[in-house]
Interface confidence: low
């Protein structure tokens, strides 16, 4: 109990800083949460003059801002790093920027990859 209907167990994983942090670069991440806490996926990225630079993707624990979001949508107007979170397995595969103040919706889809499972 305490989890959303779209229960999150696995998320797309990515770490742009994988060499320095000694992790895998990409794959799948199994989410582990505390009892009665909700689990989410997230994505963070930068947008340099229209060029999308993916920063990280993975599991995100019990954040109110992620509740009942089936899609990963960043709503900040013009942050240094875009951040979105969502509920549901692999919901962070695609991510979108849709400013709350209005403006064009921009959806980013990843290139097809053969992900490896992180343990």
């Amino acid at each position: 109990s305490g989890r959303g209907e779209a229960e999150t167990r696995e998320c797309i994983y990515y770490n742009a800083n994988w060499e320095l942090e000694r992790t895998n670069q990409s794959g799948l991440e199994r989410c582990e949460g505390e009892q009665d806490k909700r689990l989410h996926c997230y994505a963070s990225w930068r947008n340099s003059s229209g060029t999308i630079e993916l920063v990280k993707k993975g599991c995100w624990l019990d954040d109110f801002n992620c509740y009942d979001r089936q899609e990963c949508v960043a709503t900040e107007e013009n942050p240094q790093v875009y951040f979105c979170c969502c509920e549901g397995n692999f919901c962070n595969e695609r991510f979108t920027h849709l400013p709350e103040a209005g403006g064009p919706e921009v959806t980013y889809e990843p290139p097809p990859t053969a992900p490896t499972l992180l343990t």
Epitope: E34, S44, V55, K56, Q80, F83
Partner: antibody, heavy 114, light 106 residues
Framework: VQLVQSGAEVKKPGESLKISCKTS????????IGWVRQMPGKGLEWMGR????????DYSPSFQGHVIMSVDKSVSTAYLHWNSLKASDTAMYYC????????WGQGTTVTVSS | IQMTQSPSAMSASVGDRVTITCRAS??????LAWFQQKPGKVPKRLIY???SLQSGVPSRFSGSGSGTEFTLTITSLQPEDFATYYC?????????FGQGTKLEIK
């Protein structure tokens, strides 16, 4: 789950200061860390929050440019840093876990006086 | 977003039912938490998501509301409930606390 903050500090105006918030009992990068100020005899003020995953921070306009939030993932610790303290920075500072501040540190008292 | 708590102070007796109100200057859905702080102590979250009771918090505490108006209710006040209560909205930046409600013994 625990957030343990560094000890009380007494500083002079113009000096720099960095206080810490060491977390344990959970995955540090899975929760935002928020900072809250409480001036003597006053209410709670939300200063900002930092995403430990990529160190992205949101600041309240009241604190933007005067304090810097940072993290060190290798030791699961968040920091609040002042380059130049003012007497008006005298307050209790709390770190807390998550967007809705579910778990709090014990607080760090900062006294700035000449 | 401005959060206005009322009353700013009140006195009540053990066993009383007490209601504290928090109004948001614009809609915040249910992105609201309630905190209790005793003198010299760390704030403690009582309610999150406007109406969800924090684990370990006595059931005499309850929260309700959505949008712009929220209430914290304490049924049958206990001696340990005399403290200052704050609401927090975490829907829009900058997140903001109410100014606090000091609950004193009558």
């Amino acid at each position: 789950v625990q957030l343990v903050q560094s000890g009380a500090e007494v500083k002079k105006p113009g000096e720099s200061l960095k206080i810490s918030c060491k977390t344990s009992g959970y995955t540090f990068t899975h929760y935002w860390i928020g900072w809250v100020r409480q001036m003597p005899g006053k209410g709670l003020e939300w200063m900002g929050r930092i995403n430990p995953t990529d160190s992205y921070a949101d600041y309240s306009p009241s604190f933007q440019g005067h304090v810097i939030m940072s993290v060190d993932k290798s030791v699961s610790t968040a920091y609040l840093h002042w380059n130049s303290l003012k007497a008006s920075d005298t307050a209790m500072y709390y770190c807390a876990r998550g967007t809705a501040l579910g778990v709090w540190g014990q607080g760090t008292t900062v006294t700035v006086s000449s | 977003i401005q959060m206005t708590q009322s009353p700013s102070a009140m006195s009540a007796s053990v066993g009383d039912r007490v209601t504290i109100t928090c109004r948001a200057s614009q809609g915040i859905s249910n992105y609201l938490a309630w905190f209790q702080q005793k003198p010299g102590k760390v704030p403690k979250r009582l309610i999150y998501a406007a109406s969800s009771l924090q684990s370990g918090v006595p059931s005499r505490f309850s929260g309700s509301g959505s949008g712009t108006e929220f209430t914290l209710t304490i049924t049958s006040l206990q001696p340990e409930d005399f403290a200052t209560y704050y609401c927090l909205q975490h829907k829009s930046y900058p997140y903001t606390f109410g100014q606090g409600t000091k609950l004193e013994i009558k």
